[in-house]
């Protein structure tokens, strides 16, 4: 048994640009709260998934109102440590989650709003005992700087808080069997206490208070014998007395339910059902009541006034879980558009954009033009995303910056020479021939299909196409 | 503020059908996506039809065919027809609607949701 400490140091603007609002204003005034989850091991586990190793509330912090024009500073932060006792071994590897939470002040209807402000999750290695480890996270704009140690309650010590110490009987030495506690030199390691009336020749334990009971035992203190006059067990090693399965060694052996919870095996693990007043994995965590204000999210707390009642949470919309922890699938609507990816950060849906796209929906097609330049007189096209270029006669490529033969296509009609010109191309037309790609025959008589050429142009000069 | 009003719930029997409408109301520039969710007892929300962001509609696989998104963009309201009710459709529907706020940034806002019980 122990206790998990977390003392958060400082909550405020991360570095670099793009500084946060500040979460409170004259208008607003509100202050902060921590919440921390603990699970056991370093798995990748969803933020809804049980707090297995524990979960606890910080008080609120001072109320903090925002100075008009001023950047938002360091928060004003709860006093104190925040505490989850562990009642069995510490792991060593852990997961945490540290939210921020937000409480506003204003005249709300119904009490006061909460609202999250920022979530930091991490995996580390933790040694029971060990000094305070420090540690800084970032959550979107914000950081958090905080430092976290396990420590054993006693009698309990080592980097497990799975053995037990006591002072020494005598001044010189230890019992039999039994060493010195390092560090505690002037106390001994004491024999594993199990749990009370676990049957001494039938039970064991690993960890103190556990009552694991040897092959042919059952019960929770390993005093009833398994029954061998039905073999229809669907486990466990064959008995060689019996010839009948007898049942190995199952996740509800001993009981692993605190507080009078039943407990009932699941297909990985096992599952409890508590009594009125406790929850946790194993009924471990009891008195919650809704002074302690269980529901996250705004939930209202009904029943709970004492330890020993229940209490329930009903959810506001967009919430669920026992405790409305869980924020319902919001991206589900799909409101990014443009085939934006949808996140889900808890305080606001955000929207990551493909390219070409932006705004918090990715409602805006981004000018595909916009500091692009095509060379040499040609103009920027837009189109999904991608931008091209309508070059000017004479130029190509993507930008414009190649310079196109005009005469490649043979754009002179009636055998009418081209010549490339700065402009674009010329065409000297053929005797009988003219226009600006020599399309137009010049009737004998003098008079041309087309109309009157304009002034200082005679049939038959080469024709210039602009 | 924007508040979301849901009407249309009740008792019917399997087979049956009813209406749910949902109108938005409130200080709101434009509507991105809205549509209807469901949580039946001890059940996670699921969304069950809705127009996405992009104006398309989208349905749970389980109510294809029997269910009918619809909406009157000019009373910013959308609609459920739903038909071919079974019991498993039993659950709170809300209306859920993704709103561009006048201050031209986006909230995410639910109703307070209505009953459907389909029942012999």
């Known amino acids: 048994a122990g206790v998990f400490e977390l003392q958060i140091h400082s909550f405020g603007p991360g570095p670099g640009p793009g500084a946060p609002r500040s979460p409170c204003s004259a208008r607003l005034p509100c202050r902060l709260f921590f919440r921390v989850c603990l699970k056991p091991g370093l798995s990748e586990e969803a933020a809804e998934s049980p707090c297995a190793l524990g979960a606890a509330l910080s008080a609120r912090g001072p109320v903090y109102t925002e100075q008009p024009g001023a950047p938002a500073p360091d928060l004003p932060l709860p006093d104190g440590l925040l505490q989850v006792p562990f009642r069995d071994a510490w792991p060593g590897t852990f997961s945490f989650i540290i939210e921020t939470w937000r409480e506003e002040l204003g005249d709300q209807i119904g009490g006061p709003a909460w609202s999250l402000l920022a979530r930091v999750a991490g995996r580390r290695r933790l040694a029971a005992g060990g000094p305070w480890a420090r540690d800084i996270q970032r959550a979107g704009a914000w950081e958090l700087r905080f430092s976290y140690r396990a420590r054993c309650e006693p009698p309990a010590v080592g980097t497990a808080c799975t053995r037990l110490c006591r002072p020494r009987s005598a001044p010189s030495r230890c019992g039999p069997g039994l060493r010195p506690c390092a560090p505690l030199e002037d106390e001994c390691e004491a024999p594993l206490v199990c749990r009370a009336g676990c049957s001494p020749e039938h039970g064991f334990c690993e960890q103190p208070g556990e009552c694991r009971c040897l092959e042919g035992w059952t019960g929770p203190l390993c005093t009833v014998p398994v029954s061998t006059s039905s073999c229809l067990s669907p486990r466990g090693p064959s008995s060689a007395t019996t010839g009948c399965l007898v049942p190995g060694p199952g996740p509800c052996d001993g009981n692993p339910c605190a507080n009078g919870g039943s407990c009932s095996e699941t297909p990985r693990s096992f599952e409890c059902t508590c009594p009125r007043g406790f929850y946790g994995l194993r009924c471990e965590v009891s008195g919650v009541t809704c002074a302690d204000g269980p529901c996250f999210n705004g939930g209202l707390c009904v029943g709970g006034a004492d330890p020993d009642s229940a209490y329930i949470c009903h959810c506001p919309p967009g919430f669920q879980g026992s405790n409305c922890e869980k924020r319902v699938d919001r991206c589900s609507l799909q409101p990014c558009r443009n085939g934006g990816l949808c996140l889900d950060l808890g305080h606001a849906l955000r929207c990551r954009c493909r390219a070409g796209f932006a705004g918090p929906r990715c409602e805006h097609d981004l000018d595909d033009c916009a500091g692009r330049a095509c060379a040499n007189g040609g103009t920027c096209v837009e189109g999904g995303g991608a931008h091209r270029c309508s070059c000017a006669l004479g130029f190509g490529g993507r930008d414009c910056r190649e310079r196109a033969d005009p005469c490649a296509a043979r754009p002179c009609a009636h055998g009418g020479r081209c010549y490339a010109h700065f402009s674009g191309l010329v065409c000297a037309c053929a005797p009988g021939y003219m226009g600006a790609r020599c399309e137009f025959p010049v009737h004998p008589d003098g008079a041309s299909a087309l109309p009157a050429a304009p002034p200082g142009l005679r049939p038959g000069d080469p024709q210039r196409y602009l | 503020e924007v508040q979301l009003v849901e009407s249309g719930g009740g008792e019917v029997q399997p087979g049956g059908s009813l209406r749910l409408s949902c109108a938005a109301s409130?200080?709101?520039?434009?509507?991105?996506?809205m549509g209807w969710y469901r949580q039946a007892p001890g059940k996670q929300r699921e969304l069950v039809a809705g127009?996405?962001?992009?104006?398309?509609?989208k349905y749970a696989e389980s109510v294809k065919g029997r269910f009918t998104i619809s909406r009157d963009n000019a009373k910013n309201t959308v609609y459920l027809q739903m038909s071919s009710l079974r019991a498993e459709d039993t659950a709170v529907y809300y209306c859920?609607?993704?709103?561009?706020?006048?201050?031209?940034?986006?909230?995410?806002?639910w109703g307070q949701g209505t009953l459907v019980t389909v029942k012999p």
């Open positions: 859920a609607a993704d709103v561009q706020l006048l201050q031209s940034d986006y909230e995410f806002y």
């Open positions: 409130g200080s709101i520039f434009s509507i991105n996506a």
């Open positions: 127009f996405t962001g992009d104006g398309s509609t």
